[in-house]
Interface confidence: low
């Protein structure tokens, strides 16, 4: 008979996994002993390997929940083409039975005693509830049993008494204005506020409690300005030393507004707190050196190599600059006098080029002469080689940027009969005369 064939057998669950398909014979499915099969969908899964006993199942629940019972477990002979130990055919179940006891004794119900007396009403005025209780001890339950029903019951009760209303304060009223406009007078300024026992008022019959606490409260006024005190100048201090070691400087005298210090918003002292005088050291000031602009880069070379031009071989080149203008022990120029960089030499290298777009129009030349013209150009621009933009020259010193250096020989297809530069000229129109602006104003 045809079977469903699977690619895996899961030992832990005994399930077939990875359906390959149906309609094949057991013999064909089991050409691979790692496969498994089912005779029908959802049926028993049998692995294709040689038969052996499955693991024992877990024990089934105990047959009774209290006192002694028994429970079963099983294992199955699973596999194909052979027998399990004991000459048992695949599919056969083997059972084990053992005694079990979830709980030694079985629960027994108890019985209630009679109801006790009603407790007093839960309130002393208006309506409330009262309660009575009974005990589960007639007889007491055994082995975790219980009594059926409730251990207490409640009913409504009416005291036939009207409840009193107790007094409660309404919110505080606003603070009254302060008794004075500033601090420091003979009487400390105070403010007052009041409240009423009206939220609600206490009842007369039956008598309610009055509101607790005071109907008035007082506090010291805060935030009042003290009386202002005007400030007064102290004496001039000593003249400060000349603050410079060369050239002209400025010395200073100071005085403080502290005779007295202005207080409580009083006005500050009128006039200046400092006065200055010129002082002369008669010593010329040092002049720091300043770097000239960098010189031209030296040719791009590599030590021990005659030429590296037109090759993907990085070299080095340097440029220098001069520190000028240092006088009277001024600072030397900061930084390096020599700049070194890595380079590829494309000096005189024949490179493929491409014509640039037109440049912007240049200035009119000559500016003050006859018939000035302006020009624009298209240049044969070299296409630079795609050499690596960084190199590692010395082990452990990391990557260094490499720059192209030199004037290559770009080669473009001829344009308007030219190989390197095509120029277009135009006359400048409506040209004004050149006049000295100083003379114009006279």
């Amino acid at each position: 008979d045809p079977v469903l064939c699977f690619t895996q057998y899961e030992e832990s669950s005994g399930k077939c996994k990875g359906l390959l398909g149906g309609g094949v014979s057991v013999e064909d499915c089991c050409l691979n002993t790692a496969f498994a099969y089912q005779k029908r969908s959802g049926g028993l899964c049998q692995p294709c390997r040689s038969p052996r006993w499955s693991l024992w199942s877990t024990w089934a629940p105990c047959s009774v929940t209290c006192s002694e019972g028994s429970q079963l477990r099983y294992r199955r002979c699973v596999g194909w083409n052979g027998q399990c130990s004991g000459k048992v055919a695949p599919g056969t179940l083997e059972w084990q039975l053992q005694a079990c006891e979830d709980q030694q004794c079985c629960p027994e119900m108890g019985g209630w005693s009679g109801w006790g007396p009603w407790e007093p009403c839960s309130v002393t005025c208006s309506k409330g509830t009262r309660t009575r209780r009974r005990a589960c001890n007639h007889p007491a339950p055994k082995c975790g049993g219980h009594c059926p029903g409730q251990a207490q019951e409640s009913e409504a009760c009416d005291t036939q008494q009207v409840c009193p209303t107790h007094g409660a304060w309404a919110t505080w009223g606003p603070w009254t204005p302060c008794s004075a406009s500033c601090h420091g007078g003979p009487h400390e300024p105070k403010e007052t506020r009041s409240r009423k026992c009206s939220a609600p008022e206490p009842s007369q019959k039956p008598p309610g409690k009055p509101c607790p606490g005071l109907a008035y409260e007082q506090r010291r006024c805060t935030g009042l300005p003290p009386c202002p005190v005007a400030g007064g100048w102290g004496p001039w201090g000593p003249v400060s030393p000349c603050p410079v070691t060369c050239g002209l400087g400025q010395t200073m005298e100071q005085r403080t507004c502290n005779h007295p210090v202005p207080q409580h918003g009083g006005p500050f002292c009128a006039g200046d707190a400092t006065r200055t005088h010129i002082c002369n050291t008669a010593v010329p000031c040092p002049v720091d050196g300043e770097w000239d602009s960098w010189g031209e880069w030296s040719p791009c070379i590599r030590r021990n190599m005659k030429s590296i031009s037109c090759q993907e071989i990085p070299g080095q080149q340097s440029r220098g600059r001069t520190c000028r203008g240092r006088k009277f022990d001024g600072h030397r120029c900061a930084g390096q006098q020599q700049d070194i960089r890595h380079c590829y030499s494309i000096q005189h290298c024949p490179l493929k080029g491409s014509w640039s777009e037109w440049s912007t129009w240049g200035l009119c030349m000559p500016p003050c002469g006859p018939n000035p013209t302006r020009a624009r150009q298209r240049l044969c621009t070299p296409l630079l080689p795609k050499y690596p933009p960084t190199v590692s020259m010395v082990e452990g010193q990391g990557e260094k940027n490499v720059t192209f250096w030199g004037r290559p020989l770009p080669r473009c297809e001829e344009l308007q009969g030219q190989k390197l530069v095509v120029e277009e000229k135009r006359p400048c129109l409506h040209v004004p005369a050149c006049k000295d602006p100083e003379e114009e104003e006279l």
Partner: nanobody, 127 residues
């Protein structure tokens, strides 16, 4: 006519190593650049590694840096590609290429820069 012949391909488990060899019919000193390219099924040819002037400069695509090494033996007229820590995504046909040109337009790992090509050798990496 210049000929390049690759060898050393084959099947290997992930994590394993292979060494590809490319034999040239002329002295490889005459080539400025020699390189290895690869092409996986349904993908474009990709530059893997290149060597300039017998190893003065070497270039690698990012995905193989630290795993592949290009080297050459001038006496044997051979260029090699040592491939370590192979991955399933390294599966492809590997080609050897060479050129005498020196000024690049697109870069040393671009196939249109190379004049001479081998027939290729298959490398299969299984997981």
């Amino acid at each position: 006519e210049v000929q390049l012949v690759e060898s050393g391909g084959g099947s290997v488990q992930a994590g394993g190593s292979l060494r590809l060899s490319c034999a040239a019919s002329i002295s490889i000193r005459s080539f400025n650049y020699m390189a290895w390219f690869r092409q996986a099924p349904g993908k474009e040819r990709e530059g893997v590694a290149a060597s300039y002037a017998g190893g003065v400069s070497t270039y690698y695509t990012d995905s193989v840096k630290g795993r592949f090494t290009i080297s050459q033996d001038n006496a044997q007229k051979r260029v090699y590609l040592q491939m370590n820590s192979l991955k399933p995504e390294d599966t492809a046909v590997y080609y050897c290429a060479a050129t005498q040109d020196v000024i690049w337009r697109t870069g040393p790992l671009e196939s249109d820069e190379y004049r001479y090509w081998g027939q290729g050798t298959q490398v299969t990496v299984s997981s």
